[in-house]
Interface confidence: low
């Protein structure tokens, strides 16, 4: 007869490992007992369990509660055992020794490999600001055994670098994603992808990019200067900009205080019926935590009385 086993048994941390040992004998042969031991190189054998054909399973104190026989029905020639809740310390060489009648003793070895799935963590880098050079956007670290693979999934253009730290029974892999920040990256996902033989599927952690910026400011409302004449109602100036974080707006008048009746409503400056006192230089000041911008315009309120041609035009238009 001969023993059937596996060269390597691979199990994920916390799962049960089946250590196979089956005696394929001639008819009439019987298995008296099967002894399981751990036999790592350089260390003495450590007994796990003894399967006796008459007395059943005896588990050594060091493995009490952790070694069982597979559930019934059982073949009397099957000396396989289950090692419950495998931990990484269980990784190593195991030997089954089978005593048969009348053929004698047989032994076989297998290696137990315990996979430790990683638990990845993603750490965002420093605040991203438009105008910076190559900057760390995020780093992703995963520790496991064997070493996990850490990659990035994103539409954003950038560069990656990885490093690995070997611990006594695991390896930690850190990958960094660097980019040159631009406003177009705002809201874009940056996903760390961790692969490992102990995972049923890749683990993914997504970080949403936030890039601080402030666009140039401009003022709308003066496109047709002829509309800015005495008596006009509903005249307004609107300040245009965009930024991250969203900017706040402030209006001032360069050549004096804002005229009475002028309303400031965020990015909009609303005028009462126009008079010549509304002429002047108006400044829109845009700011966020990242930067500030100014845009100024000159308002020149026309007096139709001073230009008969214009007055005629206005009359004919009415």
């Amino acid at each position: 007869g001969e023993l059937e086993t596996s060269d390597v048994v691979t199990v994920v941390l916390g799962q049960d490992a089946k250590l196979p040992c089956f005696y394929r004998g001639d008819s009439g042969e019987q298995v008296g007992q099967v002894a399981w031991a751990r036999v790592d190189a350089g260390e003495g054998a450590q007994e796990l369990a003894l399967l006796h054909s008459k007395y059943g399973l005896h588990v050594s104190p060091a493995y009490e509660g952790r070694v069982e026989q597979p559930p019934p029905p059982r073949n009397p020639l099957d000396g396989s055992v289950l090692l419950r809740n495998a931990v990484q310390a269980d990784e190593g060489e195991y030997e089954c020794r089978v005593s048969t009648f009348p053929a004698g003793s047989f032994q076989a070895r297998l290696r137990l490999r315990v996979l430790v799935p990683p638990l990845p963590s993603l750490n965002p880098g420093p605040a991203l600001e438009e105008g910076q050079g190559l900057t760390l956007a995020a780093s992703c670290t995963a520790e496991g055994s064997p070493a996990p693979s850490v990659t990035w999934d994103t539409e954003v253009k950038g560069t990656t670098s990885s490093r690995s730290f070997k611990h006594s029974r695991s390896a930690a892999v850190t990958s960094e994603f660097h980019l040159v920040p631009s406003r177009s990256m705002n809201g874009q996902p940056l996903t760390c992808v961790v692969s490992h033989p102990g995972l049923l599927q890749d683990q993914r952690i997504t970080h949403i990019l936030h890039v601080s910026f402030l666009a140039e400011a401009s003022v709308r409302g003066l496109e047709d200067q002829n509309l800015w004449h005495i008596g006009r109602e509903g005249a307004m100036l609107k300040c245009l900009s965009e930024g991250q974080p969203p900017p706040s707006y402030n209006w001032t008048r360069l050549d004096g205080p804002l005229p009475s009746g002028v309303r400031v409503d965020g990015d909009t400056l609303g005028f009462p019926p126009l008079t010549t006192e509304h002429s002047g230089i108006y400044v829109c000041h845009v700011s966020n935590e990242f930067s500030s911008r100014d845009s100024q315009v000159t308002v020149d309120v026309l007096d139709p009385q001073e230009d008969s041609g214009k007055q005629v035009d206005l009359v004919s238009a009415s």
């Epitope: 916390g14 931990v87 990484q88 310390a89 430790v116 638990l119 520790e143 055994s145 006594s168 029974r169």
Partner: antibody, heavy 122, light 107 residues
Framework: EVQLVESGGGLVQPGGSLRLSCAAS????????MSWVRQAPGKGLEWVSR????????DYADSVKGRFTISRDNSKNTLYLQMNSLRAEDTAVYYC???????????????WGQGTLVTVSS | DIQMTQSPSSLSASVGDRVTITCRAS??????LAWYQQKPGKAPKLLIY???SLQSGVPSRFSGSGSGTDFTLTISSLQPEDFATYYC?????????FGQGTKVEIK
């Protein structure tokens, strides 16, 4: 019997330095990773640092990184913690602890010293 | 870092009571959890490792359970010497982190 005995604590001014020692006996010091854990007065436990058997890898809590250095001398069965640029918030009882490596790649702490008090005050 | 949250932060109980302390991890930590007991002025003592394994020499009235994010320490029949502070600790990732502690006091 496993024994861990810390020494080197005391009163030090902010910005000062101290070196803690932990003498191990009763087991094979070279086969276990070691940690320092601290406990501020009336507060909970905070892990500080770890060193592996052959000193190849050291880990630190963010709160002490760049200021504290863990080391070991396997020939003397001794663990050390060099503490520089000490702050008032470093005031605590500092324990050395043995890590139970034979269980998994993560480590619990199966033996602890009695602790040594470090007080940072002007 | 993984946050460990214990509840309750303190409890009052009588000798013979069954006491349960819970510990929740901010993310899954498999069974990489230990429980420690600390008495005033003393060093912590390991009670339970791997979430449910009893450390050698610890009385069998202490037991642990749970996996993933939710864990429990149970004292089946509280004894006078069990009045102490209990801490959970994850050691799945670096840095290892402790719960804030649960103080068990005499009612």
């Amino acid at each position: 019997e496993v024994q861990l005995v810390e020494s080197g604590g005391g009163l030090v001014q902010p910005g000062g330095s101290l070196r803690l020692s932990c003498a191990a006996s009763g087991y094979n010091f070279t086969t276990s990773a070691m940690s320092w854990v601290r406990q501020a007065p009336g507060k909970g436990l905070e892990w500080v640092s770890r060193i592996y058997q052959d000193s190849s890898t050291t880990d630190y809590a963010d709160s002490v990184k760049g200021r504290f250095t863990i080391s070991r001398d396997n020939s003397k069965n001794t663990l050390y913690l060099q503490m520089n640029s000490l702050r008032a918030e470093d005031t605590a009882v500092y324990y050395c602890a043995r890590q139970t490596e034979d269980r998994s790649y993560g480590y619990d702490l199966d033996y602890w010293g009695q602790g040594t008090l470090v007080t940072v005050s002007s | 870092d993984i946050q460990m949250t214990q509840s309750p932060s303190s409890l009052s109980a009588s000798v013979g009571d069954r006491v349960t302390i819970t510990c929740r991890a901010s993310q899954g930590i498999s069974s990489y959890l230990a429980w420690y007991q600390q008495k005033p002025g003393k060093a912590p003592k390991l009670l339970i490792y791997a979430a449910s394994s009893l450390q050698s020499g610890v009385p069998s009235r202490f037991s642990g359970s749970g996996s993933g994010t939710d864990f429990t320490l149970t004292i089946s029949s509280l004894q006078p010497e069990d009045f102490a502070t209990y801490y959970c600790q994850q050691h799945y990732t670096t840095p290892p982190t402790f719960g804030q502690g649960t103080k068990v006091e005499i009612k």
